[in-house]
Interface confidence: medium
């Protein structure tokens, strides 16, 4: 995410437009407590981080409260008074939405509608992936709201589903992170299952009426 300066690599993640996590990897300063200084506007004074992340007893990152901010984080990583990495980044471009909550499934014959709670901000895609043991890879469908209908399912098959949220690239840019996946949920004949058999079970013979 930023080029290295004096051997410093940084990573920024803006968790759900709530908390910004900046972490650094500085091989040259691996046994040094680097300090993190930041501001949210170009003309403010720098504040020092009050919530450091530690790795092997040394500072390796900072967590910042930054709720619903659409502005720039100016920051400087320092060794004492000497800046080893200074940059400015648009925080929203490193958005990682939270994992979908209250995921529900509504079945109607060969279709299922997957819903969950929409996040409080927009320009997101809600992606449902699903597969049966007969499928070699996950199928995917996504919508602008968490209301995704998947049609053409086989009621006799067991399907695994999971859901995640992605930031729209044309708004947030290409450096965002998808949310973590929701828990996998398994369904067959409109009923929840503990799991789908890894090996496909042979289809039951149809009884003639």
């Amino acid at each position: 995410q930023g080029g290295a300066a004096e051997g410093v690599q940084i990573q920024i993640i803006y968790f759900n437009l709530e908390t910004v996590q900046v972490t650094w990897n500085a091989s040259k300063y691996s046994r040094t407590n680097l300090t993190f200084h930041y501001r949210f506007n170009g003309d403010e004074a720098y504040d020092q981080c009050t919530n450091y992340l530690l790795q092997e007893g040394h500072t390796s990152g900072c967590l910042l409260d930054a709720e619903q901010r659409d502005d720039i984080l100016y920051f400087s990583i320092r060794n004492g008074t000497h800046p080893v990495f200074t940059a400015s980044r648009w925080m929203v471009y490193y958005l990682k939405p939270s994992s979908p909550k209250h995921v529900r499934f509504s079945w109607h014959q060969d279709a299922v509608t997957v819903t969950c709670s929409d996040l409080s901000y927009g320009d997101l895609l809600y992606e449902v992936q699903y597969r049966s043991p007969f499928d070699t890879e996950w199928q995917s469908k996504q919508e602008n709201t968490c209301n995704v209908t998947i049609e053409g399912l086989d009621a006799e098959k067991c399907y695994s589903f999971w859901v995640r949220v992605k930031a729209m690239e044309d708004v947030y840019g290409p450096d965002t992170y998808p949310s973590d996946w929701s828990e996998v949920t398994c369904w067959q004949r409109g009923e929840i299952r503990d799991a789908c058999a890894e090996t496909p079970t042979p289809p039951k013979p149809k009884l003639s009426k």
Epitope: G3, A5, D70, I72, A87, S88, D123, G173, P174
Partner: antibody, heavy 116, light 107 residues
Framework: QVLLKQSGPSLVQPSQSLSITCTVS????????VHWVRQSPGKGLEWLGV???????DYNAAFMSRLSITQDNSKSQVFFNMNSLQSDDSAIYYC??????????WGQGTSVTVSS | DIQMTQTTSSLSASLGDRVTISCRAS??????LNWYQQKPDGTVKLLIY???RLHSGVPSRFSGSGSGTNFSLTITNLEEEDIATYFC?????????FGGGTKLEIK
């Protein structure tokens, strides 16, 4: 179709202010910010500042003391104001739609001459 | 501020040629590099963003490459409508800065 249409004066007196309006269509100012850039023969293209979709601004430090960018979302207009103009502020001024690290659509430009 | 340098200020080529325009950044800007085309009438259009991504509607004869400090824009099979000035711009750190431009002319 994304369009940015600029309107403003072509001649400004030295020490006076420059005001340019950028009227946008095809996108919402509540969703995308707008940048301002100028181009002069002597200094090439210079980034002047940006107004975010939230209405907050960031300015090039070289112009911060005399630059103001505001917007009216309901009218889809962004207003650029620079005061204390001198002859070396003569340039073509552009507004441009912001999309992450880039300006993906530009206005037609406003050619401004500072002269008495 | 990050300085962007386009060492070639003007370039002459024939229709159908392959043309490469280079741009150098004074420090590492990762891949946050964009290319713009300015026509003689002043109209500015985005061609390539994020070093190599083609903006919508831009012909595939345009391509971009590079990372860190060295970048290039390539036009294959040069056409008459490509006569313009090309600018690079870094979007890594404020203030955003531009190269001085490369004016492309037909031989």
């Amino acid at each position: 179709q994304v369009l940015l249409k600029q309107s403003g004066p072509s001649l400004v007196q030295p020490s006076q202010s420059l005001s340019i309006t950028c009227t946008v269509s095809g996108f919402s100012l509540s969703r995308y910010g707008v940048h301002w850039v100028r181009q002069s023969p002597g200094k090439g293209l210079e980034w002047l500042g940006v107004i975010w979709r939230s209405g907050s601004t960031d300015y090039n430090a070289a112009f911060m003391s005399r630059l103001s960018i505001t917007q009216d979302n309901s009218k889809s207009q962004v207003f650029f104001n620079m005061n204390s103009l001198q002859s070396d502020d003569s340039a073509i001024y552009y507004c441009a739609k912001k999309a992450f690290y880039v300006m993906d659509y530009w206005g037609q430009g406003t050619s401004v001459t500072v002269s008495s | 501020d990050i300085q962007m340098t386009q060492t070639t200020s003007s370039l002459s080529a024939s229709l159908g040629d392959r043309v490469t325009i280079s741009c150098r950044a004074s420090q590492d800007i990762s891949i946050y590099l964009n290319w713009y085309q300015q026509k003689p009438d002043g109209t500015v259009k985005l061609l390539i963003y994020y070093t190599s991504r083609l903006h919508s509607g831009v012909p595939s004869r345009f391509s971009g490459s590079g990372s860190g400090t060295n970048f290039s824009l390539t036009i294959t099979n040069l056409e008459e409508e490509d006569i313009a000035t090309y600018f690079c711009q870094q979007g890594n750190t404020l203030p955003w800065t531009f190269g001085g431009g490369t004016k492309l002319e037909i031989k």
